[in-house]
């Protein structure tokens, strides 16, 4: 019968007696940087080419006995998970292995760098189809390793890495912390985060998604037909590398940004029990388990968006946090969040010719997060319109006045330490959906975009009584681009998008004052691109 | 022992081929930084990745590496260039004493230096 992990990543329409999805990644080459491997194992023979690259440190300990099958164990298993004939994800993918980990599974940042350089040079010498690089390893945060990954990603290579097995914030490890890399955490058959001894999968904002990583059946180096079960974020990353190979084989022109957005879009949502993660990491950790897309056709017609959290600003009075989108993505909205509720909002600003989302801490605040909504919007022309704090009691408002531009997001930012909470909420005048409204002491920023066939609408959900969380979701066929609270009263901790739902968090109900002050409205901006299909046809 | 002699020969040659007034100051207003792994047991002191500024050519990388070797030799330190990077990042991998970091950070074209560290199968 089909192993649980392959069943989990397979959409129901593919499921039969045996996992055999169409076109198993045959146009894609997957590079594996790991231990040595037993490439003539029946599961992977003819699928894996062992390169002559080897850069490993000596094994620790004077009495270390170099037993070949142990040396090959990790890499052989992962090669099998990616492309194994019986238990592999992308059965048609061809692989190349580089040895950067010794028989104890240990390597160096420098050896990994030289390996990545080897891949880049190979790519230049003999350009092939799409490349996926699997990095089933982790070390401490490394600026240089992250930089090398960034360069390789910008050369069109898809890098997939293990989040790490340290039950810790993945941002403290490399290459897991590199934004350009697809970072994968591990879940089990119950869709719970994997526990590994006293530790377990890493988590946090640097994780892109999770994938099966416990009790994964794959090729064993003990014999040429043996199988073994292994666990870890390496196994999870191998699943995503396989899924990426399948997707790229079906659509070889996909960019890294498009691939990442599709991986997120087709993932199973909200199935992981977040209680396993430390409380402060729950909101930052994506509740996504990777899956193959049910069909690649038609995916290009959708508007894909994802949420990107910044690093924490730190607690100083003037501290700010910045969230950035990938080079090929558009920043369609910007919001902020603070656990203490002390923040001075957020704004979209230009940095190096690209919009970024900056959140501002307030005096006495423990720090803020900036939350960017990053979308794939071909031929988009976006700009930010700002209205300074209004004098009138009606509040500050700004709208998209350019012909053909639609509102995709609203942000508000204030210099005062506390927005007056005694003032009643400002309501948006009806029939003006292209307008952002905010507190009169705040400056308001509207993200206005023009793109072929782009249409957006505002959806609100208001709760008169105090509540810790107010949500509003976009309906089927629409994509959440903007998420904000109306208005930015002081008890609102912030707003952020989770998949297609806008979440507005407020302070604990017991600490809020009167019911009028407790009223919170979550405002979602939902967009769709009616002509993405036509536009893509026109371009062709 | 053979290895060390080989290194020493290389250094002497480097010294002879470089002029004495060697140490160009780094570009004005930019200070190279040093980075190392926050997890102490994973550190690998004695091996360093010297990362040069983005547009540095391979020939400049090689020249900077030789310059470091020559300056180190003048101070009585043996260094070994393990790899010269090009294709992804400009720079080089060097085996040297940590005492030379201050010197290395002042070399022209240097963006930052990172001490090597361990990575592990996950």
């Amino acid at each position: 019968s089909i192993p649980w992990n392959l069943e989990r990543i397979t959409p129901p329409r593919y499921r039969a007696d045996e996992y055999q999805p169409p076109d198993g990644g045959s146009l894609v080459e997957v590079y594996l940087l790991d231990t040595s491997i037993q490439s003539d194992h029946r599961e992977i023979e003819g699928r894996v080419m062992v390169t002559d690259f080897e850069n490993v440190p000596e094994e620790d300990g004077t009495r270390f006995h170099r037993q070949a099958s142990k040396c090959d164990s990790h890499g052989t298993h992962l090669a099998g998970v990616v492309s194994g004939r019986d238990a592999g994800v992308a059965k048609g993918a061809s692989m190349r292995s580089l040895r950067v980990l010794n028989c104890q599974g240990k390597g160096t940042v420098s050896g990994t760098l030289i390996g990545l350089e080897f891949i880049r040079k190979s790519q230049l010498v003999q350009p092939v189809g799409p490349l996926v690089v699997l990095l089933p390893l982790a070390g401490g945060y490394s600026r240089v390793l992250n930089a090398a990954c960034q360069r390789l990603a910008r050369a069109g290579v898809v890098l997939v890495t293990a989040a790490g097995n340290f039950r810790d914030d993945a941002c403290l490890y490399s290459p897991a912390s590199a934004p350009e890399v697809i970072t994968v955490g591990a879940t089990n058959a119950q869709d719970q985060p994997v526990t590994l001894g006293t530790l377990g999968t890493n988590f946090g904002r640097c994780v892109d998604l999770f994938a099966p990583g416990e009790d994964i059946i794959g090729a064993s180096s003990d014999c040429s037909t043996c199988f073994v079960s292994q666990s870890g974020t390496s196994q999870a990353a191998a699943h995503v590398a396989g899924i990426a190979a399948m997707m790229l084989s079906a659509e070889p022109e996909l960019t890294l940004a498009e691939l990442r957005q599709r991986l997120i879009h087709f993932s199973a949502k909200d199935v992981i029990n977040e209680a396993w993660f430390p409380e402060d990491q729950r909101v930052l950790t994506p509740n996504l388990v990777a899956a193959l897309p049910p069909s690649t056709h038609g995916a290009g017609w959708q508007l894909f968006c994802r949420t990107v959290w910044s690093a924490h600003s730190g607690p100083t009075r003037m501290a700010t946090a910045v969230a950035r989108c990938a080079p090929d993505e558009e920043l369609l909205s910007c919001s902020s969040f603070s656990r203490s509720g002390k923040r001075r909002g957020e704004r979209m600003e230009a940095q190096g010719g690209k919009l970024v989302c900056r959140a501002h801490n307030a005096f006495g605040g423990e720090g803020v997060y900036a939350i960017a909504r990053c979308c794939l919007l071909p031929q988009a022309n976006c700009s930010v319109h700002t209205a300074p704090p209004a004098e009138a009691s009606m509040g500050t408002r700004v709208h998209c006045h350019q012909q053909g531009h639609v509102l995709t997001g609203c942000s508000s930012h204030w210099e005062v330490e506390d927005l007056g909470t005694h003032k009643p909420p400002v309501l948006r005048p009806r029939g003006q959906p292209n307008q952002c409204v905010g507190h009169r002491e705040a400056s308001i920023h509207a993200s206005c975009c023009h793109a072929p066939g782009l249409e957006c609408k505002v959806k609100e959900h208001g709760i008169p009584a105090p509540q810790e969380q107010v949500t509003v979701a976009c309906e089927e066929g629409w994509t959440l681009t903007g998420c904000s609270a109306l208005p930015g009263t002081s008890h609102v901790l912030g707003a952020y998008a989770v998949d297609n739902t806008c979440v507005v968090r407020s302070r604990d109900v017991s600490t809020t004052g009167s019911t009028s002050e407790g009223a919170v409205t979550a405002v979602a901006i939902c967009c769709r691109s009616r002509h993405l299909a036509q536009a893509s046809q026109e371009l062709q | 022992q053979e290895d060390e002699d080989g290194d020493y020969e290389e250094l002497v040659l480097a010294l002879r081929s470089e002029e004495d007034g060697l140490a160009e100051a780094p570009e004005h207003g930019t200070t190279a930084t040093f980075h190392r792994c926050a997890k102490d047991p994973w550190r690998l002191p004695g091996t360093y990745v010297v990362v040069l500024k983005e547009e540095t050519h391979l020939s400049q990388s090689e020249r900077t590496a030789r310059r470091l070797q020559a300056q180190a030799a003048r101070r009585g330190y043996l260094t070994k260039i393990l790899h010269v990077f090009h294709g992804l990042l400009p720079g080089f991998l060097v085996k040297m004493s940590g005492d030379l970091l201050e010197l290395a950070l002042k070399l022209p074209h240097v963006d930052y230096i990172e001490e090597d560290s361990s990575v592990f199968a996950q």
Epitope: D17, E18, S39, D40, G46, M49, V50, T225 | -
Partner: antibody, heavy 115, light 107 residues
Framework: QVQLVQSGAEVKKPGASVKVSCKAS????????ISWVRQAPGQGLEWMGW????????NYAQKLQGRGTMTTDPSTSTAYMELRSLRSDDTAVYYC????????WGQGTTVTVSS | DIQMTQSPSSLSASVGDRVTITCRAS??????LDWYQQKPGKAPKLLIY???TRPSGVPSRFSGSGSGTDFTLTISSLQPEDFATYYC?????????FGQGTKVEIK
């Protein structure tokens, strides 16, 4: 090009041993093992076992256990199949083939066991 | 071991004919079935692997189909060089096992 070249025909007496060689060329040796298959006169094909160039590991068919030994010498890119205690029903053409996939075959070595 | 049964054991056909050979496995082998062609005095040659995939160099007139226990090799238009013995082989389990062969002769 990818090819497997086998040693020449052998005539052996019952009870003797035979060692057939198979030299591989044109591909990355360690990525495939070598399968051995035999075919008795006028009969079908029978898989005998597999041997690794990478680490010398073997996987024998039950019928062969104890009488056959498969080895490799990566330095000469050659695989060997030795069959001991030969019987008349071991008379067959012995083929080597690349890997478990058996996508490339040697030309065959005829072994005749006759008193 | 998995038993493989081919039918017919021999057949006579003319050049240009459409020829079909079937192979049945004693248990499900998913799509792990290969077809070989063998000419007298020669080594077998891989024609089809994984039930339906043709290696490069194999003419398109050869096609394979089936999954589970029942498989078919079809030669759409028989050519003079196609007169040979054809073997199916399961690749699902160790040991790999072969069918007894189907001899295609000139009518």
């Amino acid at each position: 090009q990818v090819q497997l070249v086998q040693s020449g025909a052998e005539v052996k007496k019952p009870g003797a041993s035979v060692k057939v060689s198979c030299k591989a060329s044109g591909y990355a040796l360690y990525n495939y093992g070598i399968s051995w298959v035999r075919q008795a006169p006028g009969q079908g094909l029978e898989w005998m076992g597999w041997v690794s160039f990478y680490n010398g590991n073997t996987n024998y068919a039950q019928k062969l256990q104890g009488r056959g030994t498969m080895t490799t010498d990566p330095s000469t890119s050659t695989a060997y199949m030795e069959l001991r205690s030969l019987r008349s029903d071991d008379t067959a053409v012995y083929y080597c083939a690349r890997g478990y996939v058996m996508d490339i075959w040697g030309q065959g070595t005829t072994v005749t066991v006759s008193s | 071991d998995i038993q493989m049964t081919q039918s017919p054991s021999s057949l006579s056909a003319s050049v240009g004919d459409r020829v079909t050979i079937t192979c049945r496995a004693s248990q499900s082998i998913n799509n792990w079935l290969d077809w070989y062609q063998q000419k007298p005095g020669k080594a077998p040659k891989l024609l089809i692997y994984a039930a339906s995939t043709r290696p490069s160099g194999v003419p398109s007139r050869f096609s394979g189909s089936g999954s589970g226990t029942d498989f078919t090799l079809t030669i759409s238009s028989l050519q003079p060089e196609d007169f040979a013995t054809y073997y199916c082989q399961q690749d699902q389990d160790i040991p790999p096992t072969f069918g007894q062969g189907t001899k295609v002769e000139i009518k």
